[in-house]
C-alpha cells in the first residue's frame, strides 16, 4: 500500500513566448499521493475549468491557451493540492510576442507651406517596435525641421515645397517588419506674384501686352481686372509650366485705365489671392498725330457732326488701318462716358472731344493737324468742367477709377500752343466763343496748378463777361 | 457679347432675286464697317461687299458689281446684301462679318445663311 | 487684285507635333504705318470662320498661345507648336490692305 505523499512539483513552470493566434502550453509536472487537484491562475484569478480558450489535460498538470491574445500576457500558476501537506505552487510567465502592427496608419496630407505636418503611424508589437520612415525610396533623416516623436507619428516644422512627396512608416521588431500604404504630402503654397505687369505710357492706337507672371500650388488662376471691372476687351493668352502661370494681357488702347493682375488659388475652402497693378495712360494725342501719318479729309462722321465746323478738313490718323471709322468710334467711346458729366460741362467738353480727336487739318504736301488751343482747353479745364477735372485727377492720383472724364482722351493744356504766340498754330472752339458771349457767370473754381502755368487765366473766380483776361477773340 | 445673324437665304432660280438680312448686337453697330463674305460648297472664302460706317462708302467684288447692292440702317443695327440677276456660281453660304477699324481684321462672323441658285 | 498663295493645301499632324502653313502675297501687305495687314483664320468642321491672327502675328481674343504668326512684306507663316486634336479645320490667310480683301486658298489641316 502506497503511503501519502505531499504534493511536488517536478517541473517548475517556464517564462513562455508565444505569439499572437499561435498555441502557448504551460507545463506543471506533480508527483503526490493520491493524485493532486491542480488548478490555474492568471494574475492570482482562477482561470475556470469551462473557459473554451483554454484546455487544461493530464489531470491539470497542461494548460494549454488555444489562440493566445496580445491581452493573455500575465503570470500564470499551477496550484497542486492532495490533503497531505499544504497546497504547492509554481508560477511562469506568458510573454505575449506580437509582429509590429500599424494600428493608425498616416492618411494623405495637404498643407500650407510654412505651417506644421504630423503624419501619425501608432503601431503595436512586442518587443516594441522601433517607428521609421521613408520618403519615396530612401530612408527619412531626421533634422531639425523633421523628427519621428516617441508615437511613431513624423512631425515636420516649417513644412517646404520639397518635403512633398510620398511617405511610409516602417515598424520593426525581432519578430518582422510591418509597411504602411504609400500617402501623399502635399504641400500648397500660396499664391505669389512673381511679375508684376508693366506700366505703359502710349499713343492711341496702338497695342500694348501687359505680363503678369505667378506661382503657387495647386498652380494659380489669372484674372484681369480694368478700372474696378473685368476686362472687357483684348485677348488672355495664357501658359503654365513648372506650376509658374504667365498670362498675358493684349490690348489696343483707346483709353487709360489701372489694369489690376489677380492671381487666386484654393486651400481647401479658402482662397489667397495676389494682385499686382500697372497703368496704362495715353501720350499726347496731338502729339502722336504730329509724329503719325495721315490725310486731311471732310468729316463724314455723326457724333461730331454738329460740333465740327461744316465742310472743314480734319486729320485722319493712317496708323488706324480705317481711320476715319477708328476715330469715329474713340469719339463714340467718349461720347458714352459724358453721360456721366454735367449739363454745364457735357457740350464743352464735347466741343473739346471732337476738336480734339478730329483736328483741323492744313493739307499741303505733308498733311498736318492743327491742336486746340491752350487758352480753349484751360477753359473747359477750369470752368465748365472744373469739378469733373479735379474729381478725375484725384481718382488718378488715388489710383480710382469710375465712370466720367477720366477715360476721355482729353488733351494736356499746358502742352497745347497758345493762341497768343501765334494764332495761327491752333484751332479755336466755336462753343466757347459763343458761351463767352452769352454766360455772364461761372461757378467759382479754384485753379488746379499755379495761375502762373496758365495764361491769362484768373487766379480763383472767372466770369467771362467779366474777365478781359480770358480773351479769346 | 458681339453677335452677327443672318437671314433670308433659299432656293431662288438663276436670274432671280434675294435679300439677305444680317441683325446685329453686343456692339456700337453705327461704328463698324461690316462685310459680307460668300463660301461656294466644297470651296474657299472669298470676299464679296463691305460698307463702312461713319463715311457710308462701299465696295464689291467683280464678280458681284452691278448686281449686288450692300446697305445698313443704324437704327434697326441691321446689315443688307440686296441680290440681283442671280447665277448658279452665286450659290454659298453668306456670312456677314464684323471689321475693326483699327486692324482692318474681320473679328467676327455670323453663323452664316445658305443661297442655293438653281432651276 | 492681290493674290494670296498658300501651302500646303492639305497637312495631316500627329498630335503633339507641330504644324506650319505659309502664305505669300503678290505685293507686299506693309503699310507705311508699318502694320502688315494680314489676318489668319480657322474655319472649323460646320462652323464659320474665326479670327486667329490679325496684322500677322497678334493673336486674337482667347487664341491659345500655341498659335503663332510671323513673316512680313509677302511672306507669312503662321505655326502650332503642339497641334491639339480641336485645331482640325481649314486655315485661311486673308489680306486687308485694300479691296477686294482676298483669301488664300485654304489649308486643311487633319489629324493622321
Known amino acids: 500500500e502506497k503511503l501519502p505523499k505531499a504534493p511536488v512539483i517536478t517541473t517548475p513552470l517556464e517564462t513562455v513566448d508565444a505569439l499572437v493566434e499561435e498555441v502557448a502550453t504551460f507545463m506543471c509536472a506533480v508527483e503526490s499521493y493520491p493524485q493532486p487537484e491542480i488548478s490555474w491562475t492568471r494574475n492570482k484569478i482562477l482561470i475556470k475549468l469551462f473557459d473554451t480558450r483554454y484546455s487544461i489535460r493530464e489531470n491539470g498538470q497542461l494548460l494549454t491557451i488555444l489562440s493566445v491574445e496580445d491581452s493573455d500576457d500575465g503570470i500564470y500558476c499551477c496550484i497542486a493540492n492532495n490533503g497531505v501537506g499544504g497546497a504547492v505552487e509554481s508560477c511562469g510567465a506568458l510573454q505575449v510576442k506580437m509582429k509590429p502592427k500599424i494600428t493608425r496608419p498616416p492618411i494623405n496630407v495637404k498643407i500650407i507651406e510654412g505651417l506644421k505636418a504630423v503624419l501619425p503611424c501608432t503601431t503595436m508589437g512586442n518587443p516594441k517596435p522601433s517607428v521609421s520612415w521613408i520618403k519615396g525610396d530612401n530612408a527619412l533623416r531626421e533634422n531639425s525641421r523633421i523628427a519621428v516623436l516617441e508615437s511613431g507619428s513624423l512631425r515636420i516644422h516649417n513644412v517646404q515645397k520639397e518635403d512633398a512627396g510620398q511617405y511610409r512608416c516602417v515598424a520593426k521588431n525581432s519578430l518582422g517588419t510591418a509597411y504602411s500604404k504609400l500617402v501623399k504630402l502635399e504641400v500648397e503654397v500660396f499664391a505669389r506674384i512673381l511679375r508684376a505687369p508693366e506700366s505703359h505710357n502710349v499713343t492711341f492706337g496702338s497695342f500694348v501686352t501687359l505680363r503678369c507672371t505667378a506661382i503657387g500650388i495647386p498652380v494659380p488662376t489669372i484674372s484681369w481686372i480694368e478700372n474696378g471691372n473685368a476686362v472687357s476687351s483684348g485677348s488672355i493668352q495664357e501658359s503654365v509650366k513648372d506650376r509658374v502661370i504667365d498670362s498675358r494681357l493684349q490690348l489696343f488702347i483707346t483709353k487709360p485705365g489701372l489694369y489690376t493682375c489677380i492671381a487666386t488659388n484654393k486651400h481647401g475652402e479658402k482662397f489667397s489671392t495676389a494682385k499686382a497693378a500697372a497703368t496704362v495712360s495715353i501720350a499726347e494725342w496731338s502729339k502722336s498725330q504730329k509724329d503719325s501719318q495721315g490725310y486731311c479729309a471732310q468729316y463724314r462722321g455723326e457724333v461730331c457732326d454738329a460740333v465740327l465746323a461744316k465742310d472743314a478738313l480734319v486729320f485722319f490718323n493712317t496708323s488706324y488701318r480705317d481711320p476715319e471709322d477708328a476715330q469715329e468710334l474713340l469719339i463714340h467711346t467718349a461720347w458714352n462716358e459724358l453721360k456721366a458729366v454735367s449739363p454745364l460741362c457735357r457740350p464743352a467738353a464735347e466741343a473739346l472731344l471732337c476738336n480734339h480727336l478730329f483736328q483741323e487739318c492744313s493739307p499741303g504736301v505733308v498733311p498736318t493737324p492743327m491742336p486746340i488751343c491752350r487758352e480753349y482747353c484751360l477753359a473747359v479745364k477750369e470752368l465748365f468742367c472744373a469739378k469733373e477735372w479735379q474729381a478725375m485727377e484725384g481718382k488718378a492720383h488715388r489710383g480710382l477709377y469710375r465712370s466720367g472724364m477720366h477715360l476721355l482722351p482729353v488733351p494736356e493744356c499746358s502742352k497745347l500752343p497758345s493762341m497768343h504766340r501765334d494764332p495761327t498754330a491752333c484751332t479755336r472752339l466755336p462753343y466757347l466763343d459763343y458761351k463767352k458771349e452769352n454766360i455772364t457767370t461761372f461757378p467759382s473754381i479754384t485753379s488746379s496748378r499755379p495761375s502762373a502755368d496758365i495764361p491769362n487765366l484768373p487766379a480763383s473766380t472767372s466770369s467771362f463777361a467779366v474777365s478781359p483776361a480770358y480773351s479769346m477773340t | 457679347e458681339v453677335q452677327l445673324v443672318e437671314s433670308g437665304g433659299g432656293l431662288v432660280q438663276p436670274g432671280g432675286s434675294l435679300r439677305l438680312s444680317c441683325a446685329a448686337s453686343g456692339f456700337t453697330f453705327s461704328s463698324y464697317r461690316l462685310n459680307w463674305v460668300r463660301q461656294a460648297p466644297g470651296k474657299g472664302l472669298e470676299w464679296v461687299s463691305y460698307?463702312?460706317?461713319?463715311?457710308?462708302?462701299?465696295d464689291y467684288a467683280d464678280s458681284v458689281k452691278g448686281r449686288f447692292t450692300i446697305s445698313r440702317d443704324n437704327a434697326k443695327n441691321s446689315l443688307y446684301l440686296q441680290m440681283n440677276s442671280l447665277r448658279d456660281e452665286d450659290t454659298a453660304v453668306y456670312y456677314c462679318?464684323?471689321?475693326?477699324?483699327?486692324?482692318?481684321?474681320?473679328?467676327?462672323w455670323g453663323q452664316g445663311t445658305l443661297v442655293t441658285v438653281s432651276s | 487684285d492681290i493674290v494670296m498663295t498658300q501651302s500646303p493645301l492639305s497637312l495631316p499632324v500627329t498630335p503633339g507635333e507641330p504644324a506650319s502653313i505659309s502664305c505669300r502675297s503678290s505685293?507686299?501687305?506693309?503699310?507705311?504705318?508699318?502694320?502688315?495687314?494680314l489676318d489668319w483664320y480657322l474655319q472649323k468642321p460646320g462652323q464659320s470662320p474665326q479670327l486667329l491672327i490679325y496684322l500677322g502675328s497678334n493673336r486674337a481674343s482667347g487664341v491659345p498661345d500655341r498659335f503663332s504668326g510671323s513673316g512680313s512684306g509677302t511672306d507669312f507663316t503662321l505655326k502650332i507648336n503642339r497641334v491639339e486634336a480641336e485645331d482640325v479645320g481649314v486655315y485661311y490667310c486673308m489680306q486687308a490692305l485694300q479691296t477686294p480683301y482676298t483669301f488664300g486658298q485654304g489649308t486643311k489641316l487633319e489629324i493622321k
Open positions: 505685293q507686299s501687305l506693309l503699310h507705311s504705318n508699318g502694320y502688315n495687314y
Open positions: 462679318a464684323r471689321r475693326s477699324p483699327y486692324t482692318g481684321s474681320l473679328d467676327n
Open positions: 460698307i463702312s460706317s461713319s463715311t457710308g462708302s462701299l
